[in-house]
């Protein structure tokens, strides 16, 4: 008789999940020599241990602590780029500006980027059929808790001027319910962080509005100011030109506003 299996609302574990995590770990240590002390088999075992045989709606940050410990990494605290709803451009930016880091440029972020995973209570099986959806099922699922944990730690590590890239094409440029709005903003340390600088990325070619005056940006400024952190905001009117000028700052067209 086939065993009854919980049907969740979200997509199941990404195919080849164990192999992908292990391969990503090895790749990361190959291209980041400073992380070659990491034992990728132990990393996978700790990752697996965080969610295997556990109810996928009952995962805690504590479950991920062994993995967090193994993935401990020092990034320059004044070179952190946060992002919200504009991941691709943020990653393109740190690809060019090699001394800046998004969460996905760290080992743990790189391992889990774009993956889904969950297990089942009391069995060692990975559930490839379905996993809990944050809204429809539960928030304490393996993926959400992982990102909450690593995002909190990443924000806590930041210092001096912290940058955040925000999507100016969305109705809520700053969304209190995003990982940035609900986790990272509240875990920046006022005694270490002097300024949060928002870069609002414009989508439309002819969009010359000052999106730094958007009500949600004003809301972000208010939250940040109340935490005794200064706030500044810049419009990036031409993201394509912005990237090009990061690549080639000596280009004559890069002195004008981007």
């Amino acid at each position: 008789v086939p065993r009854w299996r919980q049907q969740w609302s979200g997509p199941g574990t990404t195919k080849r999940f164990p192999e992908t995590v292990l391969a990503r770990c090895v790749k990361y240590t190959e291209i980041h020599p400073e992380m070659r002390h990491v034992d990728c088999q132990s990393v996978w075992d700790a990752f697996k241990g965080a969610f295997i045989s556990k109810h996928p709606c009952n995962i805690t940050e504590e479950d991920y602590q062994p993995l967090m410990k193994l993935g401990t990494q020092t990034v320059p605290c004044n070179k952190i780029l946060l992002w919200s709803r504009i991941k691709d451009l943020a990653h393109q930016f740190t690809q060019v500006q090699r001394d800046m880091f998004t969460l996905e440029d760290t080992l743990l972020g790189y391992l889990a980027d774009d993956l889904t995973w969950c297990g089942e209570f009391n069995t060692s099986k990975i559930n490839y059929q379905s996993c809990p959806d944050w809204r429809k099922d539960c928030s304490n699922n393996p993926v959400s808790v992982f990102w909450k944990t690593v995002s909190r730690r990443f924000a806590e590590a930041a210092c001096d001027v912290v940058h955040v890239m925000l999507n100016g094409s969305r109705s809520k440029i700053f969304d209190k319910n995003s990982t940035f709005g609900s986790v990272e903003v509240h875990n920046l340390q006022p005694e270490k962080v002097q300024t949060l600088e928002a870069w609002v990325i414009h989508g439309g070619r002819e969009d010359s509005r000052d999106l730094c005056q958007d009500p949600t940006i004003k809301e972000l400024e208010s939250i940040i100011s109340k935490r005794n952190i200064q706030f500044s905001c810049k419009n990036i009117y031409r993201p394509d030109k912005f990237l090009q000028c990061v690549k080639n700052p000596e280009d004559s067209s890069c002195t004008s506003e981007i």
Partner: antibody, heavy 123, light 112 residues
């Protein structure tokens, strides 16, 4: 069996560009970093850069940052190198290469190499 | 960048004798994980390079036990015991401790 099959020889005019390919087989293409190495005629080996085919992220040796562009097509398991603004200095054999994994650790040595593609720059 | 300097061989080497190729790095290649990121390759005439040794002293898969690697943090030796005709070519050392990986200029082995 791991194989890296490179495209055939190319002749490029000074100032033009060439794009050469490296088709991978015998393993999951996105699971490994691909490196490129240059060997000028009768000379030694120079590392150009790497690409992570899964993410498309790249890194280059300083001297090749404006010369080489690495890309990858995951649907065909093929890595590419494009060389721009060709000069006689670019006449060389170009290799793609990959490390071996030894019990979940990258060996740090290029265990698998393509057969090389000779690029000749001539007017 | 780390500079790799290779020594020359007294050429040609008599068949059946041992040959030692030396390589020096401008800084230590010993990683905090205990591994030394020094590789040796052989490039036979008209062929792609072949990995012989990685981590200073570990033979790559399928490589004859006539090849052995040794050394310290900055001074390395590749020893070929009982040189054979198929060993002819150019030997390169390479560091992979940090980016960019750098190669020595190569040491040519010829057989008498």
């Amino acid at each position: 069996e791991v194989q890296l099959q490179q495209s055939g020889p190319e002749v490029g005019r000074p100032g033009s560009s060439v794009k050469i390919s490296c088709k991978a087989s015998g393993y999951i293409f996105t699971d490994y970093i691909m490196h490129w190495v240059k060997q000028s005629p009768g000379q030694g080996l120079e590392w150009i850069g790497w690409i992570d085919p899964e993410y498309g992220s790249t890194d280059y040796a300083e001297k090749f940052k404006k010369k080489a562009t690495l890309t990858a097509d995951t649907s065909s398991s093929t890595a590419y190198i494009q060389l721009s603004s060709l000069t006689s200095e670019d006449t060389a054999t170009y290799f793609c290469a990959r490390v071996a994994i030894i019990t979940t650790v990258a060996s740090g040595g290029f265990a698998y190499w393509g057969q090389g593609t000779l690029v000749t720059v001539s007017s | 960048d780390i500079v790799m300097t290779q020594g020359a061989l007294p050429n040609p080497v008599p068949s059946g004798e041992s040959a030692s190729i030396t390589c020096q790095s401008s800084e230590s290649l010993l990683h905090s994980n205990g591994k030394t990121y020094l590789n040796w390759y052989l490039q036979r005439p008209g062929q792609s390079p072949q990995l012989l040794i990685y981590w200073m002293s570990t033979r790559a898969a399928g490589v004859s036990d006539r090849f052995s690697g040794s050394g310290s943090g900055t001074d390395f030796t590749l020893t070929i015991s009982g040189v054979e005709a198929e060993d002819v070519g150019v030997y390169y050392c390479q560091q992979f401790l940090e980016y960019p990986p750098t190669f020595g200029s190569g040491t040519k082995l010829e057989i008498k």
